[in-house]
């Protein structure tokens, strides 16, 4: 987690900053010229900084649920939610929807009329006792409604020949209506009788091009719910042609260029307005249809499922059936198509504020999981078999309280959510006690919130009548710095830095000369990100396990030493499992120094008192050679000549040990002693 | 889409009671009824809702004194004050929530007299 904050303040300031922000409400927590905005940081970075857990303010993101058992079967459940939304983090919450049987059921019959559905319409005037039997296999209330369609009654889409608009059919001697764009013949009912009286009635029309107005017929049966009487409850359009549909854009081929407005304009029962607004388009239907909670089922012939097909991909809870040339396969359709569209569930919810984000965790009972979708999605749902969803929201920031719903599509019932801001610290010095600030503020989460006229960290120091020159000297480094680096302000003679704009950076120390981001850098973060170290004052202070400048190397010595397992041999140190050697030591172990100059003149007084007990070393001989160790064998190493204090020459070999002017030293037994002159 | 009718504000002794209505009209579907109020020179804020099957939230400031009710039949939301404060007094909005958006009214006054 990390906590990138600004200008903060307050502990609820902190709190909006992000999730990851926790704020200390220790008393003193802060040293001398700390500004608060260090109380404000992640809970492992309070922790290190000595803040004690209990000490560390961090309110969480919390769901409420809430049954509520007044009323019929309920499919979904809880019934209401209260989400209490800390900014940046999720609430989740469980929905469980149960599939009930016999939900009452509201069937709307959309039919075109075009003269190719003669046959259909034949059938369609026997259904109405077919159709009510059904629905009542179904559920225990059922009513149905009829409505039919043509096209717009204008060129291209009808000859509008004044004979061929009297009667639009082939075949004259056919009794035929004038063409149409939509007429509700029937509302909702529970009457069979009544709907085979109306639809009996009925007679077929005709048109010009294959396509027709069904979408224009389809927007006014969502757009009218009380002409059409549509109850709350799952309401069904059944929608039967045998042709393919205008959408938004062909009505320019009439002249009619005014988009579809998405409004009832039904008058008398028809949609006299259609030759003023275009066809809607399939996106707008589909909004329409979700709007009003309405379940298309396109009944069409074989040659058309296909495009309708395509068409169910677009609007949401729509099903397709093949028809058969003369409907008489209709009930049987519904019923298909009705389980079908039962069996699907879709949770989703209403229109939201950009500061509200939701996800869904489908757990579908065949063992399909879906995980943060935009909504809930099960397929073959089965009665009384409960599915669960998880229900995640997340507010951007500190939200004002508000509600929205959660409904499962085509259903009825409803999950009312209210969404709370989490944003307030409940601090425990919220006492008002007043002792704490000098009597003139209130301690509000560890800080003096000072009365006016008063300010500083305990509100000790009162504003009016001292010069600012008083309070400035001790804000200054020396006479020639200026007032807290020129990173703070001087608030009653104590340095408040200043909150950098800058992510991670603050500015602190007594005259605000120290960052936690002018160090070294390594990987492009300061001291190696926060995992190997922190930067204190320009100063890297690595983790254990870390070191050097950026924190940049695990410690580590295997690469420093020397066959005998000693680091650097001795003569360096060993930073970043690499060799430093002392001046003029080779790497990588330290072990050579080409560039040294030769031992042996040095040693020779103490090869002579080492072997022989002579010379100026003689008396004291082990201290002042106590780097020299003889050796009674021959020695590898360099090979020395040089004249002893009697003038002899003495041979002796130099082996180096680990560490600096360390020897095994072996000296010949013989001296070479050459006379002096007779 | 929606229009939506306020109505029942005037001026109120305090301790006293009023009854506001909002009748909605269109052709969407509402889900939710609610109240909002917003005082001279403050922010708007939430007082209660109503869903479509009778949950009802209140805003803290009016817990127990507020009753929301509605009448899906005629698509009104009622909202009954009693024990009206001075506080109380704001321009009291009726908002309805369709499936894709919000639809509020033009408001009608609560005034409550000390």
């Known amino acids: 987690q990390e906590c990138t904050k600004f200008k903060v303040s307050s502990c609820r300031e902190c709190i909006e900053s992000g999730p990851g922000c926790t704020w200390c409400q220790k008393l003193n927590f802060t040293g001398p010229g700390d500004p608060d905005s260090i109380r404000c940081d992640t809970r492992p970075q309070l922790l290190m900084r000595g803040c004690a857990a209990d000490d560390i303010m961090d309110p969480t993101s919390l769901a409420e649920t809430q049954e509520d058992h007044n009323g019929g079967q309920k499919q979904l459940s809880p019934q209401k939610v209260t989400l209490y939304l800390r900014p940046g983090q999720a609430a989740a919450f469980n929905v469980t929807f149960r599939r009930a049987k016999g939900y009452p059921i509201d069937l709307y019959y959309l039919m075109d009329l075009s003269y190719s559905m003669l046959d259909d319409l034949r059938n369609v005037k026997k259904l109405g006792g077919d159709l009510l039997r059904a629905l009542n296999e179904i559920t225990e209330s059922g009513r149905i409604g009829f409505g039919s369609f043509v096209d717009k009654t204008v060129l291209p889409f009808v000859n509008t020949h004044p004979d061929k608009l009297r009667n639009p059919c082939p075949n004259k001697e056919k009794e035929c209506q004038p063409p149409f764009a939509f007429r509700h013949v029937l509302k909702l009912t529970n009457n069979s009788n009544q709907f085979q009286t109306e639809v009996g009635k009925q007679l077929i029309s005709g048109n010009l091009d294959a396509p027709e107005g069904g979408l224009d017929a389809m927007m006014q049966v969502a757009a009218c719910p009380e002409e059409i009487g549509w109850r709350n409850v799952t309401r069904l359009l059944v929608f039967a042609t045998d042709d393919g549909f205008h959408f938004a854009g062909d009505g320019k081929l009439g002249a009619i260029l005014t988009p579809n407005d998405g409004r009832c304009h039904l008058e008398d029962n028809l949609y006299k307005r259609s030759n003023e607004f275009d066809y809607p388009s399939v996106g707008q239907l589909a909004h329409k249809l979700a709007e009003n909670n309405i379940q298309p089922i396109f009944a069409v012939t074989s040659r058309m499922v296909k495009t309708y097909e395509k068409l169910t991909e677009i609007i949401p809870k729509s099903a397709v059936g093949e028809l058969s040339e003369d409907s008489s396969n209709v009930v049987h359709l519904i019923k298909n198509a009705y389980n079908k569209l039962s069996s699907r569930v879709f949770l989703d919810h209403n229109a939201l504020p950009d500061t509200l984000k939701v996800t869904y965790d489908s757990f579908c009972s065949n063992g399909v999981t879906h995980r943060n979708q935009p909504r809930g999605d099960c397929d073959g749902v089965q009665i009384n078999v409960p599915i669960t969803f998880q229900v995640k929201v997340t507010a951007t920031e500190c939200i004002q309280e508000q509600s929205f719903v959660i409904r499962a599509l085509g259903f009825t019932d409803i999950v009312t959510v209210q969404v709370l801001p989490q944003c307030e610290c409940r601090c425990r010095d919220q006492s008002r006690d007043r002792s704490l600030c000098h009597g003139k503020g209130f301690l509000e989460c560890g800080i003096c919130r000072c009365d006016t006229g008063y300010i500083g960290k305990n509100c000790e120091c009162q504003t009016q009548g001292r010069s600012s020159q008083e309070l400035e000297g001790s804000c200054r480094k020396d006479n020639n710095s200026i007032i807290c680096s020129g990173l703070g302000d001087c608030v009653c003679g104590q340095c408040l830095c200043h909150t950098s704009d800058v992510p991670g950076k603050l500015i602190y120390g007594q005259y605000c000369e120290c960052d936690t981001i002018n160090c070294e850098r390594y990987n492009g973060q300061v001291c190696g990100g926060p995992g190997r170290g922190l930067c204190f004052c320009g100063k890297c202070r690595c983790h254990p396990g870390f070191e050097g400048s950026a924190c940049q190397c695990e410690r580590t010595t295997e690469g420093c030493l020397n066959p005998r397992r000693v680091e650097c041999s001795g003569r360096g140190r060993c930073r970043c499992n690499v060799c430093e050697c002392h001046s003029g030591y080779q790497l990588p172990l330290c072990q050579e120094c080409p560039g040294c100059p030769s031992p042996c003149g040095k040693y020779i007084s103490c090869a002579e008192c080492l072997k022989f007990e002579k010379g100026p070393f003689g008396k004291n001989c082990s201290a002042a050679c106590p780097g020299l160790q003889l050796s009674n064998n021959p020695v590898k190493g360099r090979t020395c000549k040089e004249r002893d204090s009697e003038g002899c020459w003495v041979a002796y070999t130099l082996e180096q040990q680990d560490g600096m002017d360390r020897y095994l030293i072996y000296v010949d037994e013989s001296r070479e002693c050459v006379a002096g002159p007779n | 889409e929606v229009q939506l009718v306020e109505s029942g504000g005037g001026l109120v002794q305090a301790g006293g009671s009023q009854k506001l209505s909002c009748a909605a009209s269109?052709?969407?579907?509402?889900?939710?009824m609610g109240w909002y109020r917003q005082a001279l020179g403050k922010k708007r804020v939430f007082v209660a809702s109503?869903?479509?099957?009778?949950?009802?939230i209140y805003g803290d400031s009016v817990k127990g004194r507020f009753t929301i009710s509605r009448d899906n039949a005629k698509n009104t939301a009622y909202l009954q004050m009693n024990s009206l404060k001075p506080e109380d007094t704001a321009v009291y909005v009726c908002?309805?929530?369709?499936?894709?958006?919000?639809?509020w009214g033009q408001g009608t006054q609560v005034t409550v007299s000390s």
């Open positions: 908002k309805a929530e369709g499936w894709y958006q919000g639809y």
């Open positions: 269109g052709s969407t579907l509402i889900y939710t």
């Open positions: 109503i869903s479509r099957d009778g949950s009802t």
